[in-house]
């Protein structure tokens, strides 16, 4: 059950409200449970775990990553600029969630759980954030086009692809994560 | 209570590698967002971290010690292991296991093994 | 390969208060607010005191308190005893899923 939506916050109603930064908190760590779950499956499957980090990187995927210059890092903090990076990066990642969805048979809820929590998060975080004109959105034909790349690759390319944005998505969000903490 | 536990030969000859596994007892080594690290300390030294494993088996390694380390686990039985390759005697240390309670927003190691002593000579 | 900075050795007096510094770059300490302090005495394996720059560990006294400013961490510790006699180590979270320790430092407390 995503964030906001357990059954046990109707029961309490004593308890405290969620603050923004608790609620983006806790629906930051759903996901990261959830891509946690589709890792288990993709390791029992193939043995793209095994894969060296570096053998993952030469691929031609352009998953988005935290850099010095994104004012994330609490040298050179900069609240919204890191903002926009986190918002610009979760949009960017949708597509390959996109993809995502037809490569999971026994967590395949799981799958499209994770792309709607992420959807979540990105409101959660547009709300939060006061210059909206700064972000970028994907270009959809550019993502159509991609997604349709991603689909003609063989198997393999298809399960290290997978691996990859599941492991990227994680570090994102973990950076993420660490990022919002200083906000 | 959480205990760790290093194990693995005392002696390693120079050129070979050294191969150490911490068993996990008091808590599942898979535990959301737990991670486990190798920590070494050469004699009258100070601590030099190795590398970690996270909750879902994704390693990361020291700069200085990336091209020789891996670290990897045996969930089944609540183990992870380090291997350090092509060591020398400046490998020599104490290597301790330690676990992160936290590694999204933690990073510090409150359980620690009690050490076990790695020397390396001919 | 890197380390953080600490003084190799201080010295406080019973009772009194002695500070430890360690330093570090905007790529550890400055970067994050990951600073953890440990407790190392003669043949055991470390002890964590502090996370997150100033939150003690379970167990620890309020005589230990840590902070930061800049590129630079502190451990305080006030009414010192002479079990606190011990080598001391800061540890950082460090760009990209590294940490990184200090040289540490030896305590030593005067009658």
């Known amino acids: 059950v995503p964030p906001g939506e357990d059954s046990k916050d109707v029961a309490a109603p004593h308890r405290q409200p969620l603050t923004s930064s608790e609620r983006i908190d806790k629906q930051i760590r759903y996901i990261l449970d959830g891509i946690s779950a589709l890792r288990k499956e993709t390791c029992n499957k193939s043995n793209m775990c095994e894969s060296s980090k570096e053998a993952l990187a030469e691929n031609n995927l352009n998953l988005p990553k935290m850099a010095e210059k994104d004012g994330c890092f609490q040298s050179g903090f900069n609240e919204e600029t890191c903002l926009v990076k986190i918002i610009t990066g979760l949009l960017e990642f949708e597509v390959y969630l996109e993809y995502l969805q037809n490569r999971f048979e026994s967590s395949e809820e799981q799958a499209r759980a994770v792309q709607m929590s992420t959807k979540v998060l990105i409101q959660f975080l547009q709300k939060k954030a006061k210059n909206l004109d700064a972000i970028t959105t994907p270009d959809p034909t550019t993502n159509a086009s991609l997604l349709t790349k991603l689909q003609a690759q063989n198997q393999w390319l298809q399960d290290m692809t997978t691996h990859l944005i599941l492991r990227s998505f994680k570090e994102f969000l973990q950076s993420s994560l660490r990022a919002l903490r200083q906000m | 209570e959480v205990q760790l536990q290093e194990s693995g030969p005392g002696l390693v000859k120079p050129s070979q590698t050294l191969s150490l596994t911490c068993t996990v007892s008091?808590?599942?080594?898979?535990?959301?967002?737990?991670?486990w690290s190798w920590i070494r300390q050469p004699p009258g030294k100070g601590l030099e971290w190795m590398g970690v494993?996270?909750?879902?088996?994704?390693?990361y390694y020291s700069p200085s010690l990336k091209s020789r380390t891996s670290i990897s686990w045996d969930t089944s039985k609540n183990q992870f292991s380090l291997q350090l390759s092509s060591v020398t005697p400046e490998d020599t240390a104490v290597y301790y296991c330690?676990?992160?309670?936290?590694?999204?927003?933690?990073?510090?190691?409150?359980?620690w093994g009690q050490g076990t002593q790695v020397t390396v000579s001919s | 390969n890197f380390m953080l900075t600490q003084p190799p050795s201080v010295s406080g007096t019973l009772g009194k208060t002695v500070t430890i510094s360690c330093a570090g770059t905007?790529?550890?300490?400055?970067?994050?607010?990951?600073v953890s302090w440990y407790q190392q005495l003669p043949g055991t394996a470390p002890k964590l005191l502090i996370h997150?720059?100033?939150t003690r560990a379970s167990g620890i006294p309020d005589r230990f308190s840590g902070s930061k400013s800049g590129n630079t961490a502190s451990l305080t510790i006030s009414g010192l005893r002479s079990e606190d006699e011990a080598n001391y180590y800061c540890?950082?979270?460090?760009?990209?899923?590294?940490?990184?320790f200090g040289g540490g430092t030896q305590l030593t407390v005067l009658g």
């Open positions: 494993i996270d909750y879902d088996g994704d390693t």
């Open positions: 997150r720059v100033s």
């Open positions: 330690a676990r992160d309670p936290d590694v999204v927003t933690g990073f510090h190691y409150d359980y």
């Open positions: 540890a950082s979270y460090r760009n990209f899923n590294n940490a990184v």
């Open positions: 008091g808590g599942s080594i898979t535990t959301r967002y737990y991670a």
């Open positions: 905007s790529s550890d300490i400055g970067g994050y607010n990951y």
